[in-house]
């Protein structure tokens, strides 16, 4: 039993860290394989998260951590039994991947103006709190060429748009997912998309 | 009422060995580190080493390195400190102490809250 | 191993008046926003030491609240609001960030 691709782990940068990797052959993660973490740190101990299967010979593992802060760094060991297939360390504040948004919600009855707001991830306490932005994706049901981004970069969780902005009569999706610059984290995932049906008035034309 | 107790001091000569012992109670012992701290007389105090809640980690001064073993019986609620090859500036007074809780991912430090009454370890010929 | 330097070693203090200790290490015991991993701890005559300060400025249980400890990175004080005769003995800062935990020499408070 070997490792094929080597544990990769990202952090949320609140209580969890997914690791994923490959091995030479199909597995059963759960029975075979340990992957045990130990924060770098005086007197702190071993604990072992129990892997899953993520495809034929994939697995992963998702670390429970009490919290992060940018100094940490945990040591990683990967054992088949008795047997260590690898040794590895891990820094989260250098690998984040933030939490998805929630709770998005498209308010369609302040004028011709749609509200676009969704939950932050993250607890006040938490420094990504305050340094997250957002991509906001809209996209036409009927229309695949009817699809657009926009940047929040501000960090209140709303967006504002014109409804004119977007075809009248038809259905639209709304999904929204955040990144933060200050750790250079990747994208999060995005959010399950809200649906809204996008009717406004036309302009009264004059002949 | 959280409590630490020690012994197994006594007078032993240069070369010689001693166990002290230091029995927890009123706390869940297994899920703390826990520390020994000495005090030569008329001197400041000395760390001598800690050990995990598991006991899988052990950390020694450079002075008793090699010559003290710590260890700890979760089953019996106690922590000892072997001393071998004694020598005459091991003399002192040795306190245990509760350190902090190691069962977490990240170990949560309350300080040196409960230390013992101490007993003293005299290295004489 | 860091060195934990205290001063002034002794400190005569008239009852009712403040007192202040200081202690400095060789390297910063902050590891993260608000945890500085330094104590103080008090010695009284023939006892055994008892924790006053964790974490740089957390008063431990039971601790009156005349007792306070401030500063970060390197540089720490202890302060005393109102020194009251019980307060004499030795106080010692010390170090939990690494191993070798260090203690400073130790402050001797005295009452005039």
């Known amino acids: 039993m070997k490792v094929l691709q080597e544990p990769t782990c990202v952090s949320d940068y609140m209580s969890i860290s997914t690791c994923e990797w490959k091995m030479n052959g199909p597995t059963n993660c759960s029975t075979e394989l340990r992957l045990l973490y130990q924060l770098v740190f005086l007197l702190s101990e071993a604990h072992t998260c129990i892997p899953e299967n993520n495809g034929g010979a994939g697995c992963v593992c998702h670390l429970l951590m009490d919290d992060v802060v940018s100094a940490d760094n945990y040591t990683l060991d990967l054992w088949a039994g008795q047997q260590l297939l690898w040794k590895g360390s891990f820094k989260p504040s250098e690998h984040v991947k933030p939490r998805a948004p929630g709770n998005l919600t498209v308010h369609t009855n302040v004028s011709d103006t749609l509200l676009l707001t969704w939950s932050n991830p993250y607890p006040p306490d938490n420094y990504l709190y305050n340094h997250l932005t957002y991509a906001v994706n809209i996209w036409s049901e009927n229309d695949p060429a009817d699809f657009r981004i926009y940047n929040v970069t501000y960090l209140e969780p709303s967006l504002r748009i014109a409804a004119s902005t977007l075809k009248s009569g038809i259905s639209y999706r709304a999904r929204v997912r955040a990144w933060a610059q200050c750790y250079n984290t990747t994208w999060s995932e995005w959010s399950p998309s809200t649906k809204w049906h996008n009717s406004y008035r036309e302009p009264f034309e004059q002949h | 009422e959280v409590q630490l107790v020690e012994s197994g001091g006594g007078l032993e000569q240069p070369g010689g060995s001693l166990r002290l012992s230091c029995a927890g109670s009123g706390f869940t012992f297994r899920d703390f580190a826990m520390t020994w701290v000495r005090q030569a007389p008329g001197k400041g105090l000395e760390w001598v080493s800690s050990?995990?809640?598991?006991?899988?980690?052990?950390y020694y001064a450079d002075s008793v390195k090699g010559r003290f073993t710590i260890s700890r019986d979760n089953s019996k609620n106690t922590l000892y400190l072997q001393m071998n090859s004694l020598r005459a500036e091991d003399t002192a007074v040795y306190y245990c102490?509760?350190?902090?809780?190691?069962?977490?991912?990240?170990?949560?430090?309350?300080?040196?809250?409960?230390w013992g009454q101490g007993t003293t370890v005299t290295v004489s010929s | 191993d860091i060195v934990m330097t205290q001063s002034p070693l002794s400190l005569p203090v008239t009852p009712g008046e403040p007192a202040s200790i200081s202690c400095t290490s060789s390297q910063s015991l902050l590891y993260s926003i608000g945890k500085n991993y330094v104590d103080w701890y008090l010695q009284k005559s023939g006892q055994s030491p008892q924790l006053l300060i964790y974490?740089?400025?957390k008063r431990a249980s039971g601790v009156p609240d005349r007792f306070s400890g401030s500063g970060s990175g390197t540089d720490f004080t202890l302060k005393i609001s109102r020194v009251e005769a019980e307060d004499v003995g030795f106080y010692y800062c010390m170090q939990s960030l690494t191993s070798p935990y260090t203690f400073g020499q130790g402050t001797k408070l005295e009452i005039k």
């Open positions: 974490l740089g400025n």
């Open positions: 050990i995990s809640g598991s006991g899988d980690n052990t």
């Open positions: 102490a509760k350190d902090r809780l190691s069962k977490t991912i990240r170990p949560r430090y309350y300080g040196l809250d409960v």
